[in-house]
Amino acid sequence: LSTGVSFFFLSFHISNLQFNSSLEDPSTDYYQELQRDISEMFLQIYKQGGFLGLSNIKFRPG
Amino acid sequence: SVVVQLTLAFREGTINVHDVETQFNQYKTEAASRYNLTISDVSVSDVPFPFSAQSGAG
């Protein structure tokens, strides 16, 4: 049965940021600020009606 | 650098995998100026069944 939703896995590097342990902890300011910026950015990119949102954001060292 | 991994959701049939990647790549310059994020090494793939539950008959 089709859900009517398509999911895409997306991965990219942010080369001007340094990874540190605070990006492993969702309660830190660094984690939350980066997550907010990325979420906002994707809402800007995929402005068209079909975009439903993003989930499962993970950060790891590059 | 920081590697970001995430899952994007779209209404079925509204975008193909090529445009997901193309639209993201075309935004990289603005991402740098607006969010101070220098983005590279973009990779996009569809999330395979069963997660996306897209095995339905046409």
């Epitope: 398509s6 | 193909n16 090529h18 569809d46």
Partner: antibody, heavy 120, light 107 residues
């Protein structure tokens, strides 16, 4: 009504270049992507690449990347495909085709085709 | 690259017959499958998109179906004007490959 009118047939020698035009009318040229397709005599269809005339963004089939250039003149509502270093296997009908607008993944209008013959 | 395997390469059928052409993709193309009809000396014409949506003005005897990697185009009752070559196309990812075509003739 939407129309894509292509330039006339061309005969070229091996090693030469050819530039095929596709004049669009009946819609806003900059809001639809224009694709180019090759059809060799008696053969099937082969996708060459596309241009987004609004942003000038192009994407090519790797097979054609080194020998084809897609451009667009917004003021003339015309898309162009230039093919370089022609060889006999480039003899084909070349079509421009408009991709439908948002979430429209198909070619809804095609040009009439331009026959390019490469012969010494 | 996604390869599109179309079969049969040619087909001869009688007026009124039910005809089915199939197209197999080498990977899941998520219903981003298009069918075109090309008559001799003419440009291709859009028939079906999103695997099963009939474009405006196309007779209802045409229908598309399938999902994942397997797709088909069916003509429920073949008419003389349906003589043409039919192509499927992957519109999921670049390069936007076409099937090799099915030449349909009337017996």
């Amino acid at each position: 009504q939407v129309q894509l009118v292509q330039s006339g047939a061309e005969v070229k020698k091996p090693g030469a270049s050819v530039k095929v035009s596709c004049k669009a009318s009946g819609y806003t040229f900059t809001t639809y992507t224009m694709h180019w397709i090759k059809q060799a005599p008696g053969q099937g269809l082969e996708w060459i690449g596309y241009i987004n005339p609004g942003s000038d963004y192009t994407h090519y089939n790797q097979k054609f990347k080194d020998r084809a250039t897609l451009t667009a003149d917004k003021s003339a509502s015309t898309a162009y495909m230039e093919l370089y270093s022609l060889r006999s296997e480039d003899t084909a009908v070349y079509y421009c085709a408009r991709q439908g607008n948002y979430a429209a993944y198909y070619f809804d209008y095609w040009g009439q085709g331009t026959l390019v013959t490469v012969s010494s | 690259d996604i390869q599109m395997t179309q079969s049969p390469s040619s087909l001869s059928a009688s007026v009124g017959d039910r005809v089915t052409i199939t197209c197999r993709a080498s990977g899941n193309i998520h219903n981003f499958l298009v069918w075109y009809q090309q008559k001799p000396g003419k440009s291709p014409k859009l028939l079906v998109y999103n695997a099963k949506t009939l474009t405006d003005g196309v007779p209802s005897r045409f229908s598309g179906s399938g999902s994942g990697t397997q797709y088909s185009l069916t003509i429920s009752s073949l008419q003389p004007e349906d003589v043409a070559t039919y192509y499927c196309q992957n519109f999921w990812n670049v390069p936007f490959t076409f099937g090799s075509g099915t030449k349909l003739e009337i017996k």
